[in-house]
Amino acid sequence: EAHKSEIAHRYNDLGEQHFKGLVLIAFSQYLQKCSYDEHAKLVQEVTDFAKTCVADESAANCDKSLHTLFGDKLCAIPNLRENYGELADCCTKQEPERNECFLQHKDDNPSLPPFERPEAEAMCTSFKENPTTFMGHYLHEVARRHPYFYAPELLYYAEQYNEILTQCCAEADKESCLTPKLDGVKEKALVSSVRQRMKCSSMQKFGERAFKAWAVARLSQTFPNADFAEITKLATDLTKVNKECCHGDLLECADDRAELAKYMCENQATISSKLQTCCDKPLLKKAHCLSEVEHDTMPADLPAIAADFVEDQEVCKNYAEAKDVFLGTFLYEYSRRHPDYSVSLLLRLAKKYEATLEKCCAEANPPACYGTVLAEFQPLVEEPKNLVKTNCDLYEKLGEYGFQNAILVRYTQKAPQVSTPTLVEAARNLGRVGTKCCTLPEDQRLPCVEDYLSAILNRVCLLHEKTPVSEHVTKCCSGSLVERRPCFSALTVDETYVPKEFKAETFTFHSDICTLPEKEKQIKKQTALAELVKHKPKATAEQLKTVMDDFAQFLDTCCKAADKDTCFSTEGPNLVTRCKDALA
């Protein structure tokens, strides 16, 4: 229904706390360099204005669209051009072009320092002094670093943060209470960020149809007892929610997500038997819980997929009459039978089926042509299964750090032109798949591994788009989203690459490395490893292991030495010489 004042409608629906949080996220995602105080001031002004519209929907400007209201606020910021350069040109445009322009200027890799967690005592002090401001800082810092973070989910993580601080700040040993819990939230939030970015990429590059196909597959796996009409309704609603969030319409997105959660909980009987626990929770927890609810038990009496999609005499007729609906039912039926497949794989199978019908239905004897289509799925299914087996075996043998290093070598050989920080970040993220997925039961590994890898590779593609340097990466990133992972997996050593000159300073280290946290030490060593591969792309695994072991031994020795500086300055050059010899 149409509302006289959109802003009043959203304020009433969401309540002041969520309204303010979402406006803060929106501003932080659009203008990523502004300070918290600048954004907090704007949020307060918008909230005060929303309250006047709630009191009188006919008041001046209350009938304006949210894009107009928010855009006008952003464009009124002083020194916009000095701080944001050409983004300021967006302000010369009218809506909806102005919002599109803001979206295009979102930076997936803003040059902001890493979000450092304050010391436990300091954190608890500022949390106790002003919990609202503390949580505002959290929303601002995360949102500006992750401009496509799913806004209602970020409110959920802020709520988690709040609960952890409330609990741990009352304990004697705040540090040991906070660290593991906050690390857990951070890890989950980072995964949520790359997953959502993938959804927005799907929407931006391939449109709503592509996202809806993803949603149909995912929902059919989770809710195999829901009928096709129910799955289609959920997929349509979920597509709308994601389109809004990806498009910066965060108030509408959060409101519609709450509506969708309400609908699911009111219609559990026709959706799934597993929803009750989620539906008993308050809003943010409920929506989060529903988004990752366990798969319902598959119906026992599902007929073979071939009956309707291969053996039926009317396959081509049904396909001709309504292509999207027929392919949608195929995707639904295949997905509900295969919770053990990744969504990417299911979409590849649906694409193969569509291509087969396109070809076969134009022949004189279609059934003879498409009769073998299910057998032709076999190699498509085997490829990711082998990938999972090979990589999980390697992870179990090497552990997370060693597995990351193996991936780093592999990817540096595939795309040596890519910057070392990007390669290290990608390899570290890709390597986490082991810890995340390889410990799961067999039937959950494939969906976990492949869908996670796809999301990480999407980030690689986004970073590479900014400064394209590798033809290999461009080739894999230009295709469809579901083909990316197999494309990257199939890449081999880039034969066109001219090896980097050996620079001693790249491998020169100082005593300050000794005091770095373990994670930072690992990154330093992985940076050196990537540089070694760039110098010798065809170095054997044995050669690289020799060098890295020597390097680890060198660090260990010098960091234990009484005079660390002298050790680094005398032993360092010897290490460099040994490295050169080992790789000669």
């Epitope: 005499q313 081509c316 007729k317 001709a320 009459e321 134009a362 004189a364 004897n365 279609p366 059934p367």
Partner: nanobody
Framework: EVQLVESGGGLVQPGNSLRLSCAAS????????MSWVRQAPGKGLEWVSS????????LYADSVKGRFTISRDNAKTTLYLQMNSLRPEDTAVYYC????????SSGGTLVTVSS
């Protein structure tokens, strides 16, 4: 919405000819193979002939081979069946269908071969 409308049937003496037409709409005609199927009184559906989307490949049931010719005009989105040397056993309702289907969702056209 997919529509298939057959025409050209009628009463004909054995040994004579008829040309059936099927006007198609509501789908990408050239992307689909098309078939003719028939149903004699009191019998089940019988496949008669098929043609590929481009018109380059054709298939015929043994019972009509050498007598019937299937063709199509993609520009006019129309399917044809030229029936020569008709026999009494060709008496049936003829339906055009999409793909190699034996379905009969259209109205059909009656062909009666009798002296």
């Amino acid at each position: 919405e997919v529509q298939l409308v057959e025409s050209g049937g009628g009463l004909v003496q054995p040994g004579n000819s008829l040309r059936l037409s099927c006007a198609a709409s509501g789908f990408t005609f050239s992307s689909f193979g098309m078939s003719w199927v028939r149903q004699a009184p009191g019998k089940g559906l019988e496949w008669v002939s098929s043609i590929s989307g481009s018109g380059s490949d054709t298939l015929y049931a043994d019972s009509v081979k050498g007598r019937f010719t299937i063709s199509r005009d993609n520009a006019k989105t129309t399917l044809y069946l030229q029936m020569n040397s008709l026999r009494p056993e060709d008496t049936a309702v003829y339906y055009c269908t999409i793909g190699g289907s034996k379905s009969r969702s259209s109205g059909g056209t009656l062909v009666t071969v009798s002296s």
